[in-house]
Interface confidence: low
């Protein structure tokens, strides 16, 4: 038996909400690395970028016993960055794809740019509440990586408890259960 102040929070992406809800493809972009083809009338085989994908994610946070009272909204930075879109009204549009041709040794990826710390309240089945400090993504950016660079995946589990109201809390095991019937 161990009783200490360590708690690990686990989040569950419950319902990813696309930045443009009318497009069903947005969700798939997040799952497939964010690659996207422009629908501006260009040949669909011409790979161009529609901008760094900022997908809006709605998720509930859980520590294994208690769940956030309301869903947390944050951005998910999706996939690989290619050039800005070659739109008809883009200045110098004719040169876009050629100028941004993908080099074999490097690639651009959409990564977290800005984050902020916010407090989130979790509610337990017995009615008690806990407050945690978590980091949420507020903006994305394109970053150049070499081929050898290891991809650093976005980690939804990098949350730390705020100063606990009480000193002793149960240490949670690593479980990604969505079962929150605990009382």
């Amino acid at each position: 038996f161990k009783n200490d102040a360590t708690e690990i929070l686990y989040s569950h992406v419950v319902k990813p909400v696309p930045a443009h809800p009318s497009s069903n493809s947005t969700l798939n972009q997040a799952r497939n690395g964010g690659r996207h083809f422009s629908n501006t009338g260009l040949d669909r085989n011409t790979r161009v970028q529609v901008g760094c994908r900022e997908l809006r994610s709605t998720k509930y946070i859980s520590d294994g016993q208690c769940t956030s009272i309301s869903p947390l909204k944050e951005l998910v930075c999706a996939g690989e960055c290619l050039p800005l879109p070659v739109l008809p009204n883009w200045i110098g549009g004719g040169y876009g794809t050629k100028y941004w041709s993908r080099r074999s040794s490097q690639e651009w990826r959409c990564v977290n740019d800005k984050t902020r710390t916010q407090r989130i309240q979790l509610q337990c089945q017995d009615g008690s509440t806990r407050t945690y400090k978590i980091t949420v993504v507020t903006a994305c950016k394109c970053k150049r990586y070499t081929r050898q660079h290891n991809e650093s995946s976005h980690n939804f589990e990098s949350m730390s408890p705020a100063k606990p109201v009480q000193h002793h809390r149960e240490r949670k095991r690593a479980s990604k259960s969505s079962k929150h019937s605990m009382s």
């Epitope: 509610q123 109201v165 009480q166 019937s181």
Partner: antibody
Framework: QIHLVQSGPELKKPGETVKISCKAS????????MSWVKQAPGKGLKWMGW????????TYADDFKGRFAFSLETSASTAYLQINNLKNEDTATYFC??????????????WGQGTLVTVSA | DVVMTQTPLSLPVSLGDQASISCRSS???????????LHWYLQKPGQSPKLLIY???NRFSGVPDRFSGSGSGTDFTLKISRVEAEDLGVYFC?????????FGAGTKVELK
Amino acid sequence: QIHLVQSGPELKKPGETVKISCKASGFSFTTYGMSWVKQAPGKGLKWMGWINTYSGVPTYADDFKGRFAFSLETSASTAYLQINNLKNEDTATYFCVRGREYYYGSGIAFWGQGTLVTVSA
Amino acid sequence: DVVMTQTPLSLPVSLGDQASISCRSSQSLEHSNGNTYLHWYLQKPGQSPKLLIYKVSNRFSGVPDRFSGSGSGTDFTLKISRVEAEDLGVYFCSQSTHVPLTFGAGTKVELK
């Protein structure tokens, strides 16, 4: 020291209303949910539900939906159980309880002394 | 709801005896986080129940080491190694893995 002090015994007639209080001390009232447990004479324990002392939102176990109401007076660190339209089967001792920790994963460590409600014509 | 079945309902003992109470749940009490939220309480006449054991085998503060809990899944046992006079009363098992919290009917430990 953590204390849950409940109001005294009540003798009521069927159809009447009773309101039991539970005054908490020795801890931050709005940090821990408050539950209520019923014990009929010579019987076992039955969890009635709980009230979120932070938000004031009550949750009732299925058998206690309708005539039962949990409420709070946060400024007085007091939780209330109100039973409307009393029936004979409501005769019981009612306990307000609090978990050892933020939830009941480590059991119900803190119990009020109980309030006996007797319903009799 | 999870049904908690205690046996025996009555347990006559002599002081100094070992006593054993069984508690069986209608479904597994192992939570998906790996913990099992099975607890034992003792209620003496005219008093509120008191927490003895939490999470199967952990003694609550101030509880003598003659009390021990064991079990897993759906089958649990409370043992008193040497019964003392102050141990007499009604023992309840309870689960808080599933909502609503439920209790066993109780086992009355009394002198023979």
